[in-house]
């Protein structure tokens, strides 16, 4: 007789997820040498002891503390970007500018990203049909505290100056909902960070507006202040040149009007 | 935080040279790539050079192309412009700015801009 299975308002976890995150640590300790230590074995059980048999709506991030620890990692916390609804360009960018690193530059955002996980409660088996959406379902759901965790530690990481890249094209340029504007903001620590550098990255081609002087803008700018960390705002006009010309600043179209 | 000082500008004859300097307070002047625009009355700042962080690339303007030179000493805190065979239409103000990125034209806003330099060319 098959056994009743809860539905969920979300996608199931992602087809081959045990051999994706395996493979992906492999990779991933392979090209980052200060990584080597890591056994990845002992990383997918860390994972996977953090939901497997445990209720979908009922994660906490204590359940991704052993995965935390295996996944320790240290990077230069002064060439940090965030970003928020502009992921794409982040990662162009950190791919460009090799010493600065998002999240997904870390082993476990590597890990993770794109991913969609959930497992059942007492059972050992992985979810793949539905897993819990964060909206109409629950936002303890296994990503959600996976994402909410490993943010919260990125930005308490962070010192000197952060950067942020933000999505001009968006009705909300700065989202308080966002994983930026609900986890990150608050867990940048004043002691340690001087000044967040938000970068608005505009989206139409001829749109010379300053959108630093947007009210999402000005309202990430007041929590920031309070926070007593200094805030600085740049418009990203043309973002697939500057990436050009970041990589490659002897490109004739870094010196040309066009 | 990095304060840019533009310097060297004057009155020159067609043809003639010039040497503008920007000076950079800031421990931090090697890691910044510089530049130097110009905007001429009534008209939009243009981009002029560009200079990266350590010097090894640079990259002109058109007009300006075999005429100027960009450079930088790093341990002088200081990026030049020598300008030569000048000529009425190079006439402007000169600014140079610093990006910890990238300096190009159009692309960004940049992280700091000096004050300007008065350039004049005669006939």
């Known amino acids: 007789v098959p056994r009743w299975r809860q539905q969920w308002s979300g996608p199931g976890t992602t087809k081959r997820f045990p051999e994706t995150v395996l493979a992906r640590c492999v990779k991933y300790t392979e090209i980052h040498p200060e990584m080597r230590h890591v056994d990845c074995q002992s990383v997918w059980d860390a994972f996977k002891g953090a939901f497997i048999s445990k209720h979908p709506c009922n994660i906490t991030e204590e359940d991704y503390q052993p995965l935390m620890k295996l996944g320790t990692q240290t990077v230069p916390c002064n060439k940090i970007l965030l970003w928020s609804r502009i992921k794409d360009l982040a990662h162009q960018f950190t791919q460009v500018q090799r010493d600065m690193f998002t999240l997904e530059d870390t082993l476990l955002g590597y890990l993770a990203d794109d991913l969609t996980w959930c497992g059942e409660f007492n059972t050992s088996k992985i979810n793949y049909q539905s897993c819990p959406d964060w909206r109409k379902d629950c936002s303890n759901n296994p990503v959600s505290v996976f994402w909410k965790t490993v943010s919260r530690r990125f930005a308490e990481a962070a010192c000197d100056v952060v950067h942020v890249m933000l999505n001009g094209s968006r009705s909300k340029i700065f989202d308080k909902n966002s994983t930026f504007g609900s986890v990150e903001v608050h867990n940048l620590q004043p002691e340690k960070v001087q000044t967040l550098e938000a970068w608005v990255i505009h989206g139409g081609r001829e749109d010379s507006r300053d959108l630093c002087q947007d009210p999402t803008i000005k309202e990430l700018e007041s929590i920031i202040s309070k926070r007593n960390i200094q805030f600085s705002c740049k418009n990203i006009y043309r973002p697939d040149k500057f990436l050009q010309c970041v990589k490659n600043p002897e490109d004739s179209s870094c010196t040309s009007e066009i | 935080d990095v304060q840019l000082q533009a310097s060297g500008g004057g009155l020159v004859q067609a043809g003639g040279s010039l040497r503008l300097s920007c000076a950079g307070s800031?421990?931090?002047?090697?890691?910044?790539?510089m530049g130097w625009f110009r905007q001429a009355p009534g008209k939009a700042r243009e981009i002029v050079a560009t200079?990266?962080?350590?010097?090894?690339?640079?990259n002109y303007a058109v007009p300006v192309k075999g005429r100027f030179t960009i450079s930088r000493d790093n341990a002088k805190n200081t990026v030049y412009l020598q300008m030569s065979s000048l000529k009425p239409e190079d006439t402007a103000v000169y600014y140079c700015?610093?990006?910890?990125?990238?300096?190009?034209?159009?692309?960004?806003?940049?992280?700091?801009w000096g004050q300007g330099t008065q350039v004049t060319v005669s006939s």
């Open positions: 200079i990266t962080r350590s010097g090894g690339s640079t």
């Open positions: 800031g421990r931090s002047f090697s890691s910044y790539a």
């Open positions: 700015a610093a990006d910890r990125f990238a300096v190009a034209s159009g692309t960004h806003d940049l992280d700091y």
